[in-house]
Interface confidence: low
């Protein structure tokens, strides 16, 4: 399937609009600090060049790889050294090392200003004045803040973003129409980014085998009627798509994702009965819909797993002949029978099964040795079940905000060295598991909760990797992908931590807190809570609750005062003194 010109091939396959959008995303994900106008200029130059190659694939440079073409273009940026420092050294390298170098410099937490949403009329005017620039700017701003965002999915978000403005800017009440849609896109976008970040971390840190195992388990749950050969084919194709996107090969990724969606729809009768509606949609919606499709019903009368994987005398023979295929079949058979398990639990079971076979197939009596392997699964299954039960009870008792606070305290005590903004962000997201998953019946709770927690803990891992401060975080993040959550759950209070010096400035608040949204006000209070725990890691729940209640009362009082700023200054001093006394600081 070799093409004389790769750039011409992708331009023709994707069409000009998608080609330009994907190149813009790729460039913004690599050079996250570059101004919008610079990126647009680079994209236009690449597009014009691609058109010359479409016209004549033998034209000069048209035979170069996309990495070479895009890397050469990025390396023409005049301010590379001043803006990006050592990233400029990448340009001295040859492909493929140059692309690897760019990838290593992607920043999960770039120093960029928060995106502030303008007034609705201002946005609608900008949309009508120049729709194309407005939408490009959306792609650029999201891509540079989320350097691993799944590019073809970002095209889907942009399509919905455009639809929202097209509809709402002509509505009677523009704000009432538009703002909820933008909030929904923002929240879905953050979730999509975090999910994709886990896929990329899985591929980059733990390798293709780990990603394929995840995919076998998830697709087998989703498509339990599909044969193992069918699931294997889908896993191979899906792995290629995500490897490409995580590697910055966004044109190939989008093209291959479209092919995969086409294949799934053309073969839906041997994959899943739930795909019909998805397959009637246009391409971007179709791909998104397939990725989110509900699990198909399990086939009736599936035989017991024990027959093939425990009782059979051929277990070791089958295992020895093709280890990964046999383990893949085990994972497929277990997962299709257990939509009620999280993917990470299924992977732990498969790992336990593999370890048992490695040990037992070398023993004098293998069958005797592995006969009880399924008994070893029981505690592995019960651990997340019990944890979810306890935490859902706590969530129902406290509500989301206070549940987040409980987790903030818990995680700050486990890993107090982690930066306060990271602890607040991660704990708030961990706390969202309650409203996201606890409403589900028991059969859906574990896959919802534990797989969501895997995504959130990966955020902690990638943020911590940028500036490592805790050996415990490093250990939990790097030892085993599937045991990250149990590893963090098992951490107790860090007894080696030396409490932070008390700094009154950290607990000084001003009248600007009164004009913040409820969410932003919560974040301020939760930031203070983390700082309190860092000062007094041995503080009891009751002590912390008393201080936080006083703090809430203080904010409420001063926000109602005529002279707010004076109130915050004077009452703030009293609050700090009272808190120090309450906590024995």
């Amino acid at each position: 399937d070799a093409h004389k010109s790769e750039v011409a091939h992708r331009f023709k396959d994707l069409g000009e609009e998608n080609f330009k959008a994907l190149v813009l995303i790729a460039f913004a994900q690599y050079l996250q600090q570059c101004p919008f106008e610079d990126h647009v200029k680079l994209v236009n130059e690449v597009t014009e060049f691609a058109k010359t190659c479409v016209a004549d694939e033998s034209a000069e440079n048209c035979d170069k790889s996309l990495h070479t073409l895009f890397g050469d273009k990025l390396c023409t940026v005049a301010t590379l050294r001043e803006t990006y420092g050592e990233m400029a050294d990448c340009c001295a390298k040859q492909e493929p090392e140059r692309n690897e170098c760019f990838l290593q410099h992607k920043d999960d937490n770039p120093n960029l200003p928060r995106l502030v949403r303008p007034e609705v009329d201002v946005m609608c005017t900008a949309f009508h004045d120049n729709e194309e620039t407005f939408l490009k700017k959306y792609l650029y701003e999201i891509a540079r803040r989320h350097p691993y965002f799944y590019a073809p999915e970002l095209l889907f978000f942009a399509k919905r973003y455009k639809a929202a403005f097209t509809e709402c800017c002509q509505a009677a009440d523009k704000a009432a129409c538009l703002l909820p849609k933008l909030d929904e896109l923002r929240d879905e976008g953050k979730a999509s980014s975090a999910k994709q970040r886990l896929k990329c971390a899985s591929l980059q840190k733990f390798g293709e085998r780990a990603f394929k195992a995840w995919a076998v388990a998830r697709l087998s749950q989703r498509f339990p009627k599909a044969e193992f050969a069918e699931v294997s084919k889908l896993v191979t194709d899906l792995t290629k798509v995500h490897t490409e996107c995580c590697h910055g090969d966004l044109l190939e990724c989008a093209d291959d994702r479209a092919d995969l969606a086409k294949y799934i729809c053309e073969n839906q009768d041997s994959i899943s009965s739930k795909l019909k509606e998805c397959c009637e949609k246009p391409l971007l919606e179709k791909s998104h819909c397939i990725a989110e499709v509900e699990n198909d019903e399990m086939p009736a009368d599936l035989p017991s797993l024990a027959a093939d994987f425990v009782e059979s005398k051929d277990v070791c023979k089958n295992y020895a002949e093709a280890k990964d295929v046999f383990l893949g079949m085990f994972l497929y058979e277990y997962a299709r029978r257990h939509p009620d398990y999280s993917v990470v639990l299924l992977l732990r079971l498969a790992k336990t099964y593999e370890t048992t076979l490695e040990k037992c197939c070398a023993a004098a009596d293998p069958h005797e040795c592995y006969a009880k392997v399924f008994d070893e699964f029981k505690p592995l299954v019960e651990e997340p079940q019990n944890l979810i039960k306890q935490n859902c009870e706590l969530f129902e008792q406290l509500g989301e905000y206070k549940f987040q606070n409980a987790l903030l305290v818990r995680y700050t005590k486990k890993v107090p060295q982690v930066s306060t903004p990271t602890l607040v962000e991660v704990s708030r997201n961990l706390g969202k598991v309650g409203s996201k998953c606890c409403k589900h019946p028991e059969a859906k709770r574990m896959p919802c909760a534990e797989d969501y927690l895997s995504v959130v803990l990966n955020q902690l891992c990638v943020l911590h990797e940028k500036t490592p401060v805790s050996d415990r975080v490093t250990k939990c993040c790097t030892e085993s992908l599937v045991n990250r959550r149990p590893c963090f759950s098992a951490l107790e209070v860090d007894e080696t931590y030396v409490p932070k010096e008390f700094n009154a400035e950290t607990f000084t608040f001003h009248a600007d807190i009164c004009t913040l949204s409820e969410k932003e006000r919560q974040i301020k209070k939760q930031t203070a809570l983390v700082e309190l725990v860092k000062h007094k890691p041995k503080a009891t729940k009751e002590q912390l609750k008393a201080v936080m209640d006083d703090f809430a009362a203080f904010v409420e009082k001063c926000c109602k005062a005529d002279d707010k700023e004076t109130c915050f200054a004077e009452e703030g001093k009293k609050l700090v003194a009272a808190s120090q006394a309450a906590l024995g600081l």
């Epitope: 092919d259 086409k262 053309e266 073969n267 839906q268 009768d269 041997s270």
Partner: nanobody, 123 residues
Framework: EVQLVESGGGVVQAGGSLRLSCAAS????????MGWFRQAPGKERERVVS????????YYADSVKGRFTISRDNAENTVYLQMNSLKPEDTALYYC????????????????WGQGTLVTVSS
């Protein structure tokens, strides 16, 4: 040994109908998507129509939509092509093909091919 044997070709007047059959042996028929391709004299081979393994999903080239119908009988290991309102430009050698993994429908995905049956539409 896998065999695909086409039958039902012949000469027909424009506007007339033909039904082609393709009998498969030597493979698990229900595990294969099936397709009909055609090659007119001096032209490249093109995909006309395909049907997925269970028969639930079909593809038709724009040039035959509304005139041709593909169906399969997994019990009989046979795929059929009902051709109505035939036109002179439908004149070609019609090949039956089987694909284990049918994605884009391009020729290279089809693993097994028949020898072809000739369809001639006279005006």
């Amino acid at each position: 040994e896998v065999q695909l044997v086409e039958s039902g070709g012949g000469v027909v007047q424009a506007g007339g109908s033909l039904r082609l059959s393709c009998a498969a042996s030597g493979l698990t028929f229900s595990s294969y998507a099936m397709g009909w391709f055609r090659q007119a004299p001096g032209k490249e081979r093109e995909r006309v129509v395909s049907i997925s393994r269970g028969g639930g999903y079909t593809y038709y080239a724009d040039s035959v939509k509304g005139r041709f119908t593909i169906s399969r009988d997994n019990a009989e290991n046979t795929v059929y092509l009902q051709m109505n309102s035939l036109k002179p430009e439908d004149t070609a050698l019609y090949y039956c093909a089987a694909a284990r993994y049918w994605a884009t429908g391009s020729e290279y995905e089809f693993d097994y091919w028949g020898q072809g049956t000739l369809v001639t539409v006279s005006s």
